[in-house]
């Protein structure tokens, strides 16, 4: 049972499982990597271990959820929740990926609209390797940092939006008919 989670650094995170916990379990432990305990609930008490999470985590014994505040990139790891009942254990793994927030993208006009209404735009995030998606009046979503398109004659303004993954920040380029760049 492995769940993947991607979050932005600085945010608060809840690590939990989609299913309900075994009834009347004896012990519940959260691990960071395979050998470091974060917190253990046993005999009605929660014990928080000396770790980089001390003071940043809280366990909800009812749901088994682990709340981590202000996650950092160094918190990237596989977290494991182990539940012990009747001398047998179960494990759930959560692979947490912490990414830095992405700044607002800059849209560069590499080839301006001309009489043929040909347009080439590039969407740039300095020093980041992220996923790009272009939205607008396009035949299909373009998942690339560069948008190239030939526009049909039109009467209304058109906008193309570049969205970068992780923080869902976006930049928009608009122009008005017939084919003049209006704003970006």
């Amino acid at each position: 049972r492995l769940v993947h989670m991607t979050v932005v650094s600085g945010s608060n995170v809840t690590l939990n499982i989609s299913e309900s916990l075994p009834e009347n379990y004896k012990q519940l432990t959260w691990f960071y990597t395979f050998d470091q305990k974060i917190v253990e609930w046993d005999s009605g008490k929660s014990k928080y271990f000396e770790s980089k999470f001390k003071g940043r985590v809280r366990l909800d014994p009812q749901s088994g959820a682990l709340y981590i505040s202000k996650v950092q990139k160094e918190d990237n790891s596989t977290y494991v929740m182990r539940v012990l009942k009747d001398g047998y254990e179960q494990e759930w793994k959560i692979k947490l990926q912490v990414l830095d927030p992405v700044p607002k993208p800059v849209i560069k006009i590499e080839k301006d609209v001309d009489d043929n209404c040909y347009l080439k735009l590039s969407c740039v995030i300095p020093g980041e390797s992220v996923n790009y998606t272009w939205y607008g009046e396009l035949p299909k979503e373009i998942q690339n940092s560069v948008l190239e398109t030939t526009l049909k004659p039109h009467k209304h303004s058109r906008c193309y939006t570049c969205q970068v993954s992780v923080s869902s920040k976006n930049g928009t380029f608009c122009f008005s008919p017939p084919c003049t760049a209006a704003r970006s």
């Epitope: 395979f34 790891s77 182990r82």
Partner: antibody, heavy 120, light 107 residues
Framework: QVQLVQSGAEVKKPGASVKVSCKAS????????MHWVRQAPGQGLEWMGG????????SYNQKFTGRATLTVDKSTSTAYMELSSLRSEDTAVYYC?????????????WGQGTLVTVSS | DIQMTQSPSSLSASVGDRVTITCKAS??????VAWYQQKPGKVPKLLIY???TRHTGVPSRFSGSGSGTDFTLTISSLQPEDVATYYC?????????FGQGTKLEIK
């Protein structure tokens, strides 16, 4: 069925290094941590360290930190234990042992053992 | 590190006897204790885990008990094939540690 097959016996001189391999089969190699336990002649069991084959994360007995190196080759489902700066007290049978759960290092599956003899 | 102290270090008993081996942890390990049997020249074999859960295929004459710092392995009726060295192990906290072993012989 789960099988752990270790490399053959080794004779080494003091100061040398030894690398013991442990080939796993019968289960998904990356889903369980692998550990190394040694046993000197007529002595008890001593845990050396463990490794998560999925990420390469390791945990060592402080006694062996700096001298023991645990690695894995996921493509061949093989775990390795290298021990450097060997001395006569390192003469022992070295076992690889698979944890029953990722976070529960008790050992239901063991390799057959590799005898390492350190002698000048 | 958590020390696991076994007693006795060796014992001799007759076939049919009830045999008890104890293990004391230097600090609370909950129930994260396993017991192993190792016959001469063989690989250790898991008998008990979580202090009292018998591993698959282990005869019912073997039982474990205890929690916190004091643990016991009991063989209710000793059989000739039980001649071996028995080890306790704690897996509550890294580094993992074993007891020094108890060598069991038949009288």
């Amino acid at each position: 069925q789960v099988q752990l097959v270790q490399s053959g016996a080794e004779v080494k001189k003091p100061g040398a290094s030894v690398k013991v391999s442990c080939k796993a089969s019968g289960y998904t190699f990356t889903e369980y941590t692998m550990h190394w336990v040694r046993q000197a002649p007529g002595q008890g069991l001593e845990w050396m360290g463990g490794i998560n084959p999925d990420t390469g994360d390791t945990s060592y007995n402080q006694k062996f930190t700096g001298r023991a190196t645990l690695t894995v080759d996921k493509s061949t489902s093989t775990a390795y234990m290298e021990l450097s700066s060997l001395r006569s007290e390192d003469t022992a049978v070295y076992y690889c042992a698979r944890a029953q759960f990722w976070t529960t290092p008790r050992f239901a599956y063991w390799g057959q053992g590799t005898l390492v003899t350190v002698s000048s | 590190d958590i020390q696991m102290t076994q007693s006795p270090s060796s014992l001799s008993a007759s076939v049919g006897d009830r045999v008890t081996i104890t293990c004391k942890a230097s600090q609370d390990v909950g129930t994260a204790v396993a017991w192993y049997q190792q016959k001469p020249g063989k690989v250790p074999k898991l008998l008990i885990y979580w202090a009292s859960t018998r591993h698959t295929g282990v005869p019912s004459r073997f039982s474990g008990s205890g929690s916190g710092t004091d643990f016991t392995l009991t063989i209710s009726s000793l059989q000739p094939e039980d001649v071996a060295t028995y080890y306790c192990q704690q897996y509550s906290t890294y580094p993992i540690t074993f007891g020094q072993g108890t060598k069991l012989e038949i009288k």
